[in-house]
């Protein structure tokens, strides 16, 4: 994928609201292009903060102002509504509501939109077409919550338009505006180290790979040309500069480490894999 982001591409907004008691609450709002955070919400000034130079996409200032007002109004209304119905819905303080909504692109075409709400970390209700539906496992509380949310059909219509029309338009503009950044290729650095000893006579070998972009990467411990199936890959973690970090570990008997190497494949390397040998493990690729 030329944009350096795995398909399907998505843009989503996440709203995490913590209700500590009847009057004390807090919320965090963020916008994400797949797994790259592009926007955040400043609650003090009720403004959208653009985290990348291209985060505005092709939306006009007028549209951004409207979105800011929309988030401010909907946050107020959501807090007000949840506070009013908390007792009726048997929401017990403290509790957390998480909402995530957005749209997906596949091969440059809109493949769908989504809006889901979780209560205390569990699926609760979701928005389908023009109305809210309960997750079957969520029970009667969720059914009642949907009844409340579906009282304002016109707001649901606007939500539907935002998801099916505004969001796809925005994601296309965002991809276009961020093309240079998203298509960049940054070569990884790699180094080897010892991990904590797994037991007497055994070693944990660690292969660190950092600073690469885009995210897809292949890292494997090898013996000659033989992939070592015991290789444990960690999660690919984000770095502050927008690149990625990964570690791959392998547990071996102390005497078997000598002819092991760590091989790294990444699109930025253009086929020139990084290979680091354990026997001279101060090497950096």
């Amino acid at each position: 994928n030329a944009d350096g982001l795995k398909e399907p591409l998505s843009f989503h907004v996440t709203w995490i609201a913590s209700f500590y008691n009847h009057s004390w609450k807090q919320n965090l709002v963020s916008g994400w292009l797949s797994d790259l955070q592009t926007h955040t919400w400043d609650s003090n000034s009720s403004t959208i903060v653009f985290l990348c130079p291209w985060s505005r996409g092709n939306f006009s200032n007028e549209e951004w102002k409207e979105l800011e007002t929309l988030f401010r109004i909907r946050t107020i209304r959501s807090f007000e509504g949840i506070r009013r119905y908390a007792h009726e819905l048997q929401f017990e303080y403290p509790f957390e509501i998480q909402v995530t909504g957005g749209c997906e692109l596949h091969s440059g075409k809109v493949s769908g939109s989504f809006l889901q709400l979780a209560y205390q970390g569990s699926d609760f209700v979701s928005f389908q077409n023009n109305s809210w539906l309960p997750y079957p496992v969520a029970g009667n509380m969720a059914k009642h919550f949907c009844k409340v949310l579906n009282q304002n059909q016109h707001e649901n219509d606007i939500t539907h338009n935002l998801l099916s029309d505004t969001c796809p338009r925005f994601i296309l503009g965002l991809l276009d505006a961020g093309k240079a950044h998203l298509q960049r290729q940054v070569k990884p650095e790699a180094w080897l180290s010892h991990g904590p000893s797994p037991g007497p006579g055994h070693l944990q070998l660690v292969c660190h790979v950092s600073g690469f972009y885009p995210k897809p990467v292949w890292v494997m411990w090898m013996r000659g040309e033989q992939e070592q199936q015991g290789t444990q890959r960690g999660d690919i973690l984000p770095s502050a500069d927008g690149t990625w970090y990964l570690r791959a570990t392998l547990e071996v008997a102390a005497g078997e480490a000598a002819d092991l190497s760590c091989r790294v494949k990444h699109s930025s390397l253009e086929g020139q894999d990084i290979v680091l040998y354990w026997e001279h493990h101060s090497s950096v690729g």
């Epitope: 606007i158 029309d165 505004t166």
Partner: antibody, heavy 118, light 107 residues
Framework: EVQLVESGGGLVQPGGSLRLSCAAS????????MNWVRQAPGKGLEWVSY????????YYADSVKGRFTISRDNAKNSLYLQMNSLRDEDTAVYYC???????????WGQGTLVTVSS | EIELTQSPSSLSASVGDRVTITCRAS??????LNWYQQKPGKAPKLLIY???SLQSGVPSRFSGSGSGTDFTLTISSLQPEDFATYYC?????????FGQGTKVEIK
């Protein structure tokens, strides 16, 4: 600067038809829902019809359902109201209004007068 | 259909007066209420949205309050250009409906 300019009003006999147009400029027309609101002489405001940004959702007031048709052409930044089977009580100034994403009418045209009379 | 009842229907006031107009909804509409000002021969102008938010460019002497069924528009110090008709409008359910209007006249 946001501008909405209505046209197409005039004198028509009961049972006749008219097509109102609203030309929009100064904002991203295709992003917003639009409405028609009318005001009979010396009376208050009455909402007539709503169309979503992509025309996927349309609503009408009961008083015009089956007789009026709202439509839009995002490529031309234009909103329309086709009015058929006009009645005396449809006499009013018709305004097109831009709707915000939080459900208020933030910009209105200057209005076009429709007079239904024999 | 949600009915909105404004009171008073008309009022006479002097420049500098504090003016309060109320709007009562036939059922709870949360904060889905807007206020408009209309001068003779002109289109309505949005003053307040979502019950209490001041529309950009509107003087701060205008304020809105209320939630549920009872709402208020307040003009803290009436100015000559404020003599007009004021309408409330609910956007809680379709069809959106307007109050019958309150005419503010010079005493």
């Amino acid at each position: 600067e946001v501008q909405l300019v209505e046209s197409g009003g005039g004198l028509v006999q009961p049972g006749g038809s008219l097509r109102l147009s609203c030309a929009a400029s100064g904002f991203t027309f295709s992003s917003y829902s639009m409405n028609w609101v009318r005001q009979a002489p010396g009376k208050g405001l009455e909402w007539v019809s709503y169309i979503s940004s992509s025309s996927s959702t349309i609503y009408y007031a009961d008083s015009v359902k089956g007789r009026f048709t709202i439509s839009r052409d995002n490529a031309k930044n234009s909103l329309y109201l086709q009015m058929n089977s006009l009645r005396d009580e449809d006499t009013a100034v018709y305004y097109c209004a831009k709707e915000t994403w939080w459900q208020s009418f933030d910009y209105w045209g200057q209005g076009t007068l429709v007079t239904v009379s024999s | 259909e949600i009915e909105l009842t404004q009171s008073p229907s008309s009022l006479s006031a002097s420049v500098g007066d504090r003016v309060t107009i109320t709007c009562r909804a036939s059922q709870s509409i949360s904060s889905y209420l807007n206020w408009y000002q209309q001068k003779p021969g002109k289109a309505p102008k949005l003053l307040i949205y979502a019950a209490s938010s001041l529309q950009s460019g509107v003087p701060s002497r205008f304020s809105g309050s209320g939630s549920g069924t009872d709402f208020t528009l307040t003009i803290s110090s009436l100015q000559p250009e404020d003599f007009a008709t004021y309408y409330c409008q609910q956007s809680y359910s379709t069809p959106p409906t307007f109050g019958q209007g309150t005419k503010v006249e010079i005493k």
